[in-house]
Interface confidence: low
């Protein structure tokens, strides 16, 4: 969690002199409680916005917006504390709006916004706006909270953000998986425009079960520049285990921007429908032969073997 670094943070608006300050998330009104405290925020809204840093990087940000209730407590409102909690890590970041002038009622409802909390793809946050001073321990709460789920890098706008692009979001491998026979699976995918290696992770499951019955990892060496954006195909040899028929193929790239931490793409082949009358299984006839120059690989732990080739 961090704040976008691109410009001075502003909270002033006509009729209000205001400054944004870093906060420890423990406002001193907890420590020095005040008898008269403002009411809670109204209509807290959190939206996904996008903002550029000074360096030109594009990041997803939480756009926080709320209004004030139209009661006399605004006379005691000294500011607001904005808190963002990342739910999976318990990491919290806060800022404080400090009002340098007294609020007065005017013809429009007071409205505040803040769009500087940088958020991560595929993460959930709890956003809280506390009006300050905070209430005495037994007082009515004067905060409002909302959960906010950030889409993953598949989301159209997220895909072009710096964190997603660094993870390889622009690569669309367009994976196709085809069962050649009971023992062979063919995987086709589009290579990206970087000379880096890939791993194909095959996990097979019995029909309707989630415990794997076969796992196999296959290494694809880095393509040459003339092979960028070309289709590559691999034939994986399966373990001949009865009922081990649902195959999940995952492709892990190792792009320079994300290395071991790149976005993976997967495709699944379901078990075939059982025919009413069993048909004889034909002898294996390979539907694809490696051309000269391609390599044959055998997994070192003898779990299975694979062939791969890049199409030109």
């Amino acid at each position: 969690l961090r704040l976008l670094d691109h410009r001075a943070l502003v909270c002033s608006q006509p009729g209000l002199n205001c400054t944004v300050k870093n906060s420890t998330c423990l406002d001193d009104s907890w420590i020095h409680p005040r008898n008269l405290t403002p009411s809670s925020p109204k209509d807290l809204q959190i939206q996904l916005h996008f903002a550029h840093t000074q360096q030109g990087d594009l990041f997803p940000v939480a756009h926080i917006e709320w209004t004030l209730q139209t009661d006399a407590s605004i006379l005691y409102l000294e500011g607001a504390e904005l808190s963002v909690l990342q739910l999976n890590t318990n990491e919290r970041l806060c800022v404080r709006f400090e009002f340098l002038s007294k609020l007065r009622h005017h013809h429009r409802r007071w409205r505040f916004t803040f769009s500087h909390f940088v958020v991560d793809p595929d993460q959930e946050y709890e956003v809280t706006v506390h009006h300050l001073p905070k209430p005495i321990p037994d007082g009515d709460p004067n905060h409002q909270s909302k959960n906010f789920l950030v889409p993953d890098c598949e989301h159209a706008r997220m895909k072009v953000t710096t964190p997603c692009m660094s993870s390889g979001s622009l690569w669309d491998p367009n994976i196709t998986v085809e069962t050649l026979d009971t023992q062979h699976l063919r995987v086709d995918f589009t290579l990206w425009n970087e000379s880096t290696h890939y791993q194909i992770l095959l996990t097979s499951f019995p029909h309707m079960e989630n415990h794997s019955c076969f796992e196999h990892m296959h290494h694809i060496p880095a393509p040459r520049p003339e092979e960028f954006h070309q289709r590559s195909n691999v034939t994986l040899t399966l373990r001949n285990l009865k009922g081990c028929c649902r195959h999940q193929v995952q492709i892990q790239p190792f792009f320079s921007s994300c290395l071991n931490d790149c976005l993976r793409h997967s495709a699944t082949v379901s078990c075939p429908e059982m025919p009413d009358t069993p048909e004889p299984i034909p002898d294996y006839m390979p539907l694809w032969e490696p051309r000269s120059g391609s390599s044959d690989y055998k997994d070192d732990d003898d779990k299975g073997s694979s062939h791969h080739h890049h199409h030109h």
């Epitope: 290395l259 931490d261 690989y297």
Partner: antibody, heavy 118, light 107 residues
């Protein structure tokens, strides 16, 4: 210039704690996985720990598991190694190192020396 | 875990000699292997990655070969500045183990 600078080493008693830092500059730190590697006096290199770019994947050598914690602050371009319950055999020069696409580690710091002794 | 061994542990050769260091993995690691050079009192430097790809700036007298479990680092013509300890390292999956090292000096 791509650079890694370690700090935080020193003399500590067995059972004590130390926190090493590695300051990165000259490259987009937040896009790279990072490693700690150590070398005991007169001995070979020993890989200690790995953390991926977004801290989603972390690995430790068996010899330090449960005692050392790797972390990073991408906003500060910094890598850390929190070392607790230190033992005599943790005495070493500790290097932070950046992995290269395709493999290996192509950028290393100068190292910081940790001495565990009573 | 996969173990990495190197041989010889040390060697002495004359300037101009061809020097070969071998590294063996206890299980296959495809070509996920790197070689480093470490001079006394200095940090390690990457020489070779992906078993046989020369790191930029490294002299062409260094070369690497092998795949699976057996790998070789060759210095085609030993130079005085090549006096160092050489380490192999696997990086297919954690732990990213180093070999014990081979110390090379001049006769």
């Amino acid at each position: 210039e791509v650079q890694l600078v370690e700090s935080g080493g020193g003399l500590v008693q067995p059972g004590g704690s130390l926190r090493l830092s590695c300051a990165a500059s000259g490259f987009t730190f937040s896009s790279y996985s990072m490693n700690w590697v150590r070398q005991a006096p007169g001995k070979g290199l020993e890989w200690v720990s790995f953390i991926s770019a977004r801290s989603s994947t972390i690995y430790y050598a068996d010899s330090v598991k449960g005692r050392f914690t790797i972390s990073r602050d991408n906003a500060k371009n910094s890598l850390y190694l929190q070392m607790n319950s230190l033992r005599d055999e943790d005495t070493a020069v500790y290097y932070c190192a950046r992995p290269k696409v395709g493999g290996g580690m192509d950028v290393w710091g100068q190292g910081t020396t940790v001495t565990v002794s009573s | 875990d996969i173990q990495m061994t190197q041989s010889p542990s040390s060697l002495s050769a004359s300037v101009g000699d061809r020097v070969t260091i071998t590294c063996r993995a206890s299980q296959g690691i495809s070509n996920y292997l790197a070689w480093y050079q470490q001079k006394p009192g200095k940090f390690p430097e990457l020489l070779i990655y992906a078993a046989s790809t020369l790191q930029s700036g490294v002299p062409s007298r260094f070369s690497g070969s092998g795949s699976g479990t057996d790998f070789t680092l060759t210095i085609s013509s030993l130079q005085p500045e090549d006096v160092a300890t050489y380490y192999c390292q696997k990086y297919n999956r954690a732990p990213f183990t180093f070999g014990p090292g081979t110390k090379v000096d001049i006769k």
